[in-house]
């Protein structure tokens, strides 16, 4: 018989797989229909009747073609340090991303398990490497001739202004102060900022220590306290 003529359930020919969007039911020993995303198997197939599918209930989902008896629970609501970038629907789990000024310190299969605030470099230190969705800011001491007088996760070290006559020499955390005669060269007013990382990757997190009821193939890794990097300050 030409392929895809038999209706489910049917016994496959020896050595043959089931067809598209079908599964082999070991109990019935038949090829049966899978349930589409957004549904689950309410009644499994038998030798004479196909799978009966039903829609997922509120706050549950199935993302794949399946024959699971129950839909998966959507993850818990996004925490205050996150933004919901994908709502929980019958076909997809909720996805949360870290809000601006935060990064994903511990990711999971789809999204983020734990957001943390981006490190702020204290005066005397500037941003050596800006934060990203998944990495913290790296601070570095301002080199001679440069300074940073802010506590910031975006400001880099800026050159001291050059004075005709120096009133107070600059240091790592303070600009040079010139005498009343104007400096020969001055940086543009205002701090130099690095752009904030933009979160585009799908992320989802659990804001509370309690495990979500949603099964996950990723593992919760232990995360001990980490010492602050030199020149950084906690929030």
């Amino acid at each position: 018989l030409p392929a895809q003529v038999a209706f489910t359930p049917y016994a496959p020919e020896p050595g043959s797989t089931c067809r598209l969007r079908e599964y082999y039911d070991q109990t019935a020993q038949m090829c049966c229909s899978k349930c589409s995303p957004g549904q689950h198997a309410k009644v499994f197939c038998t030798k004479t009747s196909d799978t009966v599918c039903d829609s997922c209930e509120d706050s549950t989902y199935t993302q794949l073609w399946n024959w699971v008896p129950e839909c998966l629970s959507c993850g818990s609501r996004c925490s205050s340090d996150q933004v919901e970038t994908q709502a929980c629907t019958r076909e997809q789990n909720r996805i949360c991303t870290c809000r601006p000024g935060w990064y994903c310190a511990l990711s999971k299969q789809e999204g983020c398990r734990l957001c943390a605030p981006l490190r702020k470099c204290r005066p005397g230190f500037g941003v050596a490497r800006p934060g990203t969705e998944t990495s913290d800011v790296v601070c570095k001491p301002c080199a001679p001739g440069t300074f940073s007088n802010t506590t910031s996760s975006t400001d880099i070290c800026r050159p001291h202004q050059i004075c005709n006559v120096v009133a107070i020499p600059g240091n790592a955390s303070m600009d040079a102060v010139c005498t009343s005669t104007s400096p020969t060269r001055s940086m543009a007013p205002g701090a130099v900022h690095l752009p904030q990382p933009v979160s585009t990757r799908s992320q989802h997190t659990q804001p509370t220590p309690e495990p979500s009821t949603a099964p996950s193939t990723s593992f919760l890794l232990p995360m001990g306290p980490s010492p602050p990097a030199e020149g950084s300050t906690g929030d």
């Epitope: 895809q4 496959p12 050595g15 043959s16 797989t17 598209l20 969007r21 073609w65």
Partner: antibody, heavy 119, light 107 residues
Amino acid sequence: QVQLVQSGAEVKKPGASVKLSCKASGYTFITYDINWVRQAPGQGLEWIGWIYPRDGNTQFNENFKGKATMTVDESTSTAYMEVRSLRSDDTAVYYCARGDRDYGYFDVWGQGTTVTVSS
Amino acid sequence: DIQMTQSPSSLSASVGDRVTITCQASQDISNYLNWYQQKPGKAPKLLIYFKSKLETGVPSRFSGSGSGTDFTFTISSLQPEDIATYYCQQGNTLPLTFGGGTKLEIK
């Protein structure tokens, strides 16, 4: 990274057989179908069939039943396809491709093996 | 078997142009329509599956639409690296079948 690497080009005489190989790496070999697709010179693509490495079961395009045999060696993550009774119109590039049986697509392809059938 | 008819079979366009290719199935295939790009001497590459889902890593200038029997593949702004042959393929019913291809050239 996920890849499929195929064996080298073959030149065969009409009536002969050829056995092509496709070695998978970068993913769990037994969880995805390996499909075979061929492309005659200057022509389009033609699906031959798939094999499910977990149990070795297959699904064929009717046009290739009795013409092609698909097997796997789970220990080396390699799929094979033998094509028998070769004719000049079997001259083609033969591709292996990882398939998705829910949406019917091929997301990872081998580089192809050129089979030339000539007397 | 389901026949897939692609049109045009070839087309020429300029960099920056919006390019549209159509694919017609001989019977209803729901949304089970996939699109591939094939460059000379290379294997096909999956661009779009299930009518409009973009494969990971594929630029957003590629898109797909349609349903039932009539489908459209669009490149919103043609880039030099898009020169290739494009194939549609139905994933609804066995045997899996491909369109005849559309060869895209730069004007």
